[in-house]
Interface confidence: low
């Protein structure tokens, strides 16, 4: 079957849209009237209250839309709505760093139904966004390369459809945990893929299989750059008990959403935080997350590391290839940004069994204490570890060392760190030395060698 609409063209239930393994039922999208796609414009001039706009000259001219600014569309996913706080929060953070037309796309008319139907309705949403982009180009000479479409869940595939319909001329699409069911393993025509825009970046946060883990997001790479924070499957802070999950810092409703789909929602929270942390989400190229956590992918290569989220487009090699995979760790609550350091400690003093911790002090801030090694502490041995600090300490000025004995030792042995090397993710090294040794639980300050 096929259904046609005046502005948007025709929609078929032929393969690959339906009748394939991943979507066996022949279902057509609802009509544009029923999906009721709305465009809610926020700008630096109206950051708190949207202006509803349409692909119409008088509507755009009568709004705060500025043709000399970039335009970022934000498309929500299944069950969600364009007026939900998270979309406006993305806009508000954008206004802190740039002048921009921030358009929240509401399609709750088509998202609040069964998942299979909603997954077809995104074709209408994508067509509406494409129509809007093409209208801006024809009416105002506005270049599609100045358009960035950000889509969460089903919204990521709606963004892909908008990009496909504009022949890949859109400047950038960001997929925030693109939805898995009905999309994973499907032909590129159906889902978000790298040909949908000049640059496609993706954040995967809920990549466990839908069975048995109820993971709503794709594990499949679908962009030029695909980021897998915390491995892309289980996000820190998402396994809280039910009560603490629901009574969330952001309120009961956000907590209820988190309880139901915490990993899946993390993607837009990471993106929101990334806007105001331009270097807090460095993604490391790596064979897998297991290899990353084994400390084998540090520091960044000579070409640098891309930033997951808003600043991914600053990466020089962003379109060198498709399906480039990057790994990183985040925090367990906002602020999610983290800065990774490698610390190597050369020991001095007595041989004991215990563990050593180091804290960093720099021109931008100080870190907590992080454990570097646990086991036999032998003089002249060197132990290395990597950790993710919730503080960007900047240029290192000093480090502090402390050690703890694993046994009660009446002889009060003394241990020191003759040298500590701290390496930042860009490969910058700072060397600190001390000739002293200290008893357990006593801080030792090391200064530049």
């Amino acid at each position: 079957k096929e259904v046609c609409y005046e502005r948007l063209g025709c929609f078929s239930d032929d393969s690959p849209w339906s009748g394939i393994t991943e979507r066996p039922l022949h279902i057509l999208p609802w009509s544009p009237k029923d999906v009721n796609t709305r465009f809610l414009l926020y700008t630096n001039e109206n950051p708190n209250n949207f202006q509803e706009v349409a692909a119409d000259s008088s509507s755009i001219s009568g709004s705060n839309f500025k043709t000399n600014r970039k335009t970022r569309f934000i498309i929500h996913g299944f069950i969600d709505k364009g007026e939900e706080n998270w979309l406006a929060n993305v806009c508000k953070n954008l206004f802190k760093v740039e002048s921009v037309n921030c358009i929240c796309v509401d399609w709750k008319g088509g998202s609040r139904t069964g998942y299979t139907q909603a997954s077809q309705n995104i074709r209408i949403v994508g067509a509406e966004v494409a129509y809007f982009v093409e209208f801006l180009q024809s009416a105002f000479g506005y270049s599609p390369s100045n358009v960035h479409v950000i889509g969460h869940s089903l919204g990521a595939h709606a963004a892909g459809e908008a990009g496909r319909r504009t022949n890949g001329t859109i400047g950038r699409i960001t997929g925030l945990d693109p939805a898995e069911p009905c999309f994973q393993g499907t032909p590129e025509l159906v889902r978000l893929d790298p040909s949908d825009a000049k640059f496609v970046d993706v954040i995967h946060t809920d990549g466990a299989p839908i069975v048995p883990n109820l993971g709503f997001g794709m594990s499949q790479v679908v962009g030029h750059l695909d980021f897998f924070p915390n491995g892309g499957v289980e996000m820190p802070g998402c396994k809280k008990n039910i009560l603490s999950q629901i009574v969330d810092i952001d309120g009961i409703w956000e907590g209820t959403r988190d309880f139901a789909a915490c990993n899946h929602l993390r993607s837009y929270k990471y993106y929101t935080d990334s806007i105001v942390n331009p270097d807090g989400f460095a993604g490391f190229p790596c064979a897998s997350y297991n290899v990353f956590t084994a400390n084998k992918c540090f520091p960044c290569p000579s070409g640098g590391c891309p930033q997951m989220g808003h600043y991914a487009d600053r990466y020089p090699g962003k379109t060198n290839d498709v399906g480039q995979k990057f790994y990183l760790d985040t925090g367990d609550a906002s602020n999610f940004a983290r800065w990774r350091y490698k610390v190597s400690v050369t020991l001095s003093g007595k041989k004991v069994t215990g563990h050593i911790l180091v804290s960093l002090f720099g021109n931008k801030g100080n870190s907590k204490q992080y454990e570097i090694f646990k086991g036999t502490l032998k003089p002249d041995s060197t132990h290395s570890n990597e950790f993710d600090s919730d503080v960007d300490v900047g240029d290192l000025q000093m480090v502090k060392f402390i050690w703890y004995n694993n046994v009660i030792n009446p002889t009060l042995p003394r241990v020191g760190a003759s040298k500590i090397i701290v390496e930042t993710n860009v490969g910058k090294q700072f060397n600190f030395c001390s000739p002293e040794t200290v008893r357990e639980e006593v801080l030792l300050t090391l200064t530049p060698c």
């Epitope: 991943e22 979507r23 066996p24 039922l25 279902i27 299944f78 069950i79 969600d80 069964g114 998942y115 299979t116 139907q117 997954s119 069911p181 009905c182 109820l214 709503f216 409703w253 209820t256 959403r257 309880f259 139901a260 789909a261 899946h264 929602l265």
Partner: nanobody, 120 residues
Amino acid sequence: QVQLQDSGGGLVQAGGSLRLSCAASGSIFSSDLMGWYRQAPGKEREAVARITRGGTTSYADSVKGRFTISRDNAKNTMYLQMNSLKPEDTAVYYCNARRSNYDRSWGDYWGQGTQVTVSS
């Protein structure tokens, strides 16, 4: 009152078949995801198969090709057709309904369980 009534379990020989049924009250049958879980003695409950409201199915690797999940919207009933049963399929099977992932009325609902025993 939301209710899930699962039935159809029993004793069957290896290689045999069973069909489990899960009758749901109307309000919960409209749930986006429904599925079957099982729990063998001394083991954790594990997902066996799921089906979306639109009919998209997915299966655990251990049952792929042997089990088929389906739902009859007119009868508000979900089924699990189990063929080529093996002794390791022995477990209590539970029917599950899960509301849309971020619907305000989201919830997880379970049947009381039906015993499936496969003898060798």
